[in-house]
């Protein structure tokens, strides 16, 4: 009778196996700032150091009373999840605990700093194997918590912060806000996400997957022995952090980047209800729900890329939005999304030597995204070649002139402020493969990528009659790099890719007027890495 | 997120000069002042001051210090709780929210966060 | 050879008292814990309370609270049950084990039989 | 409180054949249960730990398994000595001890 989150986690071919580091030992080892924990529960005995860091404020009230398995309560019970002998994720990691959070589950962020330096400097007296940090608290939107974590990540550290339990954007809180963390929202037994009384679990674009965040049996400091269940997005990033671990521990080498990737690409897609979330939260809320991926020894050499959503630009008539990705990341294409449609463009720049997307608002617009498309491609070399806008009624084509590039997505950018005068872009697929075409006072930006054995196709569907959105998707074996919608209605809200799935959005006012000849087409772009292979344009 | 969200920061007004002490009107305030939005999560009177990120380690000492000594000259006195090395430059400290023009004008200062709570979740 | 002998068993008015012992040897008594359980004729096992073996604290099922009182003279490595106000009900083998909390009741002595009549 | 129910109450077999005792929790306890043998005039005695680890002593044909809420003990071919009653027990925090009802294992 295994507990549901662990059969829904860690799919069945994985239930009996043990991971181990190729040496044979188990060397990831597991931070976690919390509360107090009971080290001598038999889930985690002889498994967990309990440090003596301790750095907490004063709990609140004269008559509060410290007892001990309360204290200890929300931090065993975490420890329990990420490796508990029984209940555990991870069974075999061993875990480390710091002290950020008080008998009332109140910490600081100036504590959570302190802790966070403390893990720096331990790596800095006696470098060991893996570190993964587990961060199962939040407090409001903290430039230097984010900031810290970044550094943190970048001397190699794994950090999987909860989303928050405040039924919130994510982003309006830290660290689950900061970029190089893995933030993680709760689902329920039902993949449904998670209602705690009259809050529940974050969501928006901050949020890179959910995982078991719902009546979920862990360790209890009631006694050694004792379970019981505890519910939020701590015991969800809980999950993701022993997936981390165990991730770590079969292949010690996987950068931030990788784990990031590979957890998204073999989490369980479009199980959750989206209804659930505020509705201009769910086109960025990641419908994604965690599972322990296999090795890259059994999957090869998969292309696998990610969507990443600015924040919202704000209404301003120049207002820009910019979305970037991951450092080890490559941008391979950059979208646009506006709720009104009132959009002028995207494009893709360097800024201090990373190329980021960015996207433009257009005159009466309330605010648009920059969708960027994050992918691993080993050994890649991509840039970026753009026309600037033709004269009046010409097409300007871009395509990748250098050897063995292929394109992997393109960008359209308008000059003019006036919506109705210009037609939308497009990718031609057949007339001239390989390029990017755009229409009137549209700059047309292609990226072209060189890669081992990487090769790309556009593929594009069409729909005539009204519709909200035209959807195409990459088969089986494919990759979506680029997602763009090309002429049809006069107003389209823009593009975004949704896992392998290109979505082409159209305004709701734009069904009424559209002829049926008006086709509005969602080309992808949709790309494969075949290391024996050299790269390629598939017609 | 890149961008800062529901949150505050402020850019104090300050004075081109304070008490004509010369060596402080030469340094212009340019770091900011950010706190959590959330006022019931607020901790006033703890702040976390955060140095430009080439900041060596000699020098983030000075800093505080240096916030010391000129705070002991209006008549305050504050405490460094903790210095920052190993994550980012900076130092944490317990002061009167009075003294926050006078440390944005410190030289190294990127900006000054004052502390807030965080929540097991 | 860990060793547990109760003693102290026998036949008690309804209302009276009696304390048993339990003398341990075979090992560091100090450092052990102990616990007493005990069977009614023909019924299942019932745990009465323990006594920590690193502050010499005790605890107790909610049945026993007021009735039983568990304690130790480590330099005599003998283990005591104080039982008070005894009833027809109280009639049972009492046994004394070591355990190890969190784990398992791994030495039990032969058990004392105690009888509460008139 | 956590409760333990055993079944069957009484099992009625002959030296030799199979005899499988099951322990139900009320609630998740992991593999933190044991068994324990208790021969008529007799103590108790730990047979075993953590749900499938025999004690010191214990003849390889008893077996135990389970986790979660479910266990089980198998005495795989049943010798005379084997007719017994067989407690399960688990910790919990109040009380700490807790028995099954236990289950007689009686020559047919």
């Known amino acids: 009778s295994i507990p549901w989150n662990l059969e829904r986690i860690i799919p069945a071919w994985h239930q009996t196996e043990e991971d181990r580091s190729p040496d044979g030992s188990s060397q990831v080892e597991v931070y976690l700032l919390d509360t107090s924990i009971q080290g001598a529960h038999r889930e985690i005995e002889g498994r967990v150091t309990i440090t003596d860091f301790n750095s907490v404020p004063e709990e609140d009230g004269t008559r509060f009373h410290r007892q001990a398995s309360k204290c200890d309560s929300h931090g065993t019970h975490l420890a329990g999840v990420v490796s508990g002998r029984d209940a555990g994720v991870a069974k075999g990691t061993s875990l480390h605990s710091l002290r950020v959070l008080n008998c009332q589950g109140k910490g600081t962020v100036s504590g959570t700093l302190i802790g966070l330096e403390f893990i720096r400097k331990s790596q800095l007296i006696q470098p060991s194997g893996p570190l993964v940090v587990l961060l199962p608290l939040a407090g409001g939107y903290s430039r230097i918590l984010n900031a810290a974590c970044r550094h943190l990540a970048r001397t190699g550290v794994v950090l999987v912060a909860a989303a928050g339990n405040f039924r919130d954007d994510a982003c309006l809180y830290s660290p689950a806000s900061a970029p190089e963390v893995i933030t993680v929202g709760a689902t329920n037994a039902q993949d449904q996400p998670v209602t705690l009384g009259t809050l529940g679990t974050n969501f928006g674009r901050c949020v890179d997957l959910f995982a078991p965040g719902k009546d979920i049996i862990g360790a209890s400091s009631d006694c050694s022995t004792c379970f019981m269940s505890q519910s939020g997005t701590s015991q969800a990033a809980a999950h993701v952090a022993g997936i981390v671990a165990r991730m770590l521990s079969r292949e010690p080498t996987l950068t931030l980047a990788e784990l990031r990737q590979r957890l998204i690409h073999f989490s369980t897609k479009d199980v959750i209800n989206m209804a659930w979330f505020p509705e201009d939260q769910q086109v960025l809320t990641p419908n994604l729900v965690a599972t322990l991926p296999p090795s890259t020894h059994e999957t090869g050499g998969q292309l696998l890329c990610r969507t990443v959503w600015s924040a919202h630009s704000g209404p301003t008539r120049t207002a820009t939005a910019t979305a970037r990705c991951a450092p080890e990341e490559e941008l391979l294409s950059c979208s646009s999304f506006s709720r009104s449609g009132r959009r002028r463009g995207d494009w893709i720049e360097a800024i201090g030597g990373q190329q980021v997307c960015k996207a433009l608002n257009a005159f009466g617009g309330e605010g648009v995204y920059a969708v960027a498309r994050c992918c691993l491609v080993p050994r890649a070399n991509c840039s970026i070649h753009n026309t600037p806008a033709a004269r009046a009624g010409l097409e300007t084509h871009v395509h990748c002139h250098q050897k063995d590039h292929v394109l992997t997505g393109c960008s359209f950018h308008w000059e003019v402020e006036d919506l109705s005068v210009r037609r939308q872009p497009a990718l031609r697929s057949r007339r001239q493969p390989g390029q990017c075409v755009g229409h009137q006072a549209a700059s047309v930006y292609a990226s072209c990528c060189h890669a081992p054995g990487l090769e790309c196709k556009i593929k594009e569907h069409g729909i005539s009659g009204p519709s909200e959105q035209v959807t195409v998707a990459c088969e089986a074996g494919w990759t979506l790099t680029g997602c763009n919608v090309l002429p049809g209605a006069s107003l389209t809200l823009g593009a975004y890719s949704v896992d392998n799935l290109c979505v082409a959005r159209v305004h709701d006012t734009a069904r009424a007027d559209r002829t049926s000849g008006e086709a509005t087409v969602a080309a992808a772009i949709c790309c494969r890495s075949r290391p024996s292979a050299k790269a390629s344009w598939v017609q | 997120q890149d961008e800062d969200g529901d949150y505050e920061e402020l850019m104090l007004a300050l004075p081109s000069q304070e008490d004509g002490l010369a060596d402080e009107a030469a340094h212009v305030a340019t770091a900011t002042f950010r706190r959590c939005s959330k006022e019931a999560w607020r901790l006033p009177g703890t702040y976390i001051v955060v140095l430009m990120e080439e900041t060596q380690r000699l020098q983030i000492e000075q800093t505080a210090h240096r916030l010391q000594t000129r705070a002991a000259r209006r008549g305050y006195v504050i405490k460094v709780l903790h210095i920052f090395y190993d994550l980012f430059p900076g130092f944490l400290v317990k002061m009167s929210s009075d003294l926050l023009g006078l440390a944005l004008k410190l030289p190294h200062v990127e900006y000054i966060e004052e502390d807030s709570f965080v929540f097991a979740q | 050879q860990v060793q547990l002998l109760e003693s102290g068993g026998g036949l008690v008015q309804p209302g009276g008292s009696l304390r048993l012992s339990c003398k341990a040897s075979?090992?560091?008594?100090?450092?052990?814990?102990f616990t007493w359980v005990r069977q009614a004729p023909g019924k299942g096992l019932e745990w009465i309370g323990w006594?920590?073996?690193?502050?010499?604290?005790?605890r107790y099922n909610e049945k026993f609270k007021g009735k039983a009182t568990i304690s130790r003279d480590n330099s005599k490595n003998t283990l005591y049950l104080q039982m008070n106000s005894l009833r027809a009900e109280d009639t049972a083998v009492y046994y004394c084990?070591?355990?190890?909390?969190?784990?398992?009741?791994?030495?039990w002595g032969q058990g004392t039989l105690v009888t509460v009549s008139s | 409180e956590i409760v333990l129910t055993q079944s069957p109450a009484t099992l009625s077999l002959s030296p030799g054949e199979r005899a499988t005792i099951t322990c139900r929790a009320s609630?998740?306890?992991?593999?933190?249960l044991n068994w324990y043998q208790q021969k008529p005039g007799q103590a108790p005695r730990l047979l075993i730990y953590?749900?499938?680890n025999r004690a010191t002593g214990i003849p390889a044909r008893f077996s135990g398994s389970g986790s979660g809420t479910d266990f089980t003990l198998t005495i795989s071919s049943l010798e005379p000595e084997d007719f017994a009653v067989y407690y399960c027990?688990?910790?919990?925090?109040?009380?700490?001890?807790?028995f099954g009802g236990g289950t007689k294992v009686e020559i047919k």
């Open positions: 084990a070591r355990y190890r909390v969190g784990y398992s009741l791994d030495y």
């Open positions: 075979g090992y560091t008594f100090s450092r052990q814990g």
């Open positions: 006594i920590d073996p690193g502050n010499g604290g005790t």
């Open positions: 609630q998740y306890v992991g593999s933190y």
């Open positions: 953590d749900a499938s």
């Open positions: 027990q688990v910790w919990d925090s109040s009380p700490p001890v807790v």
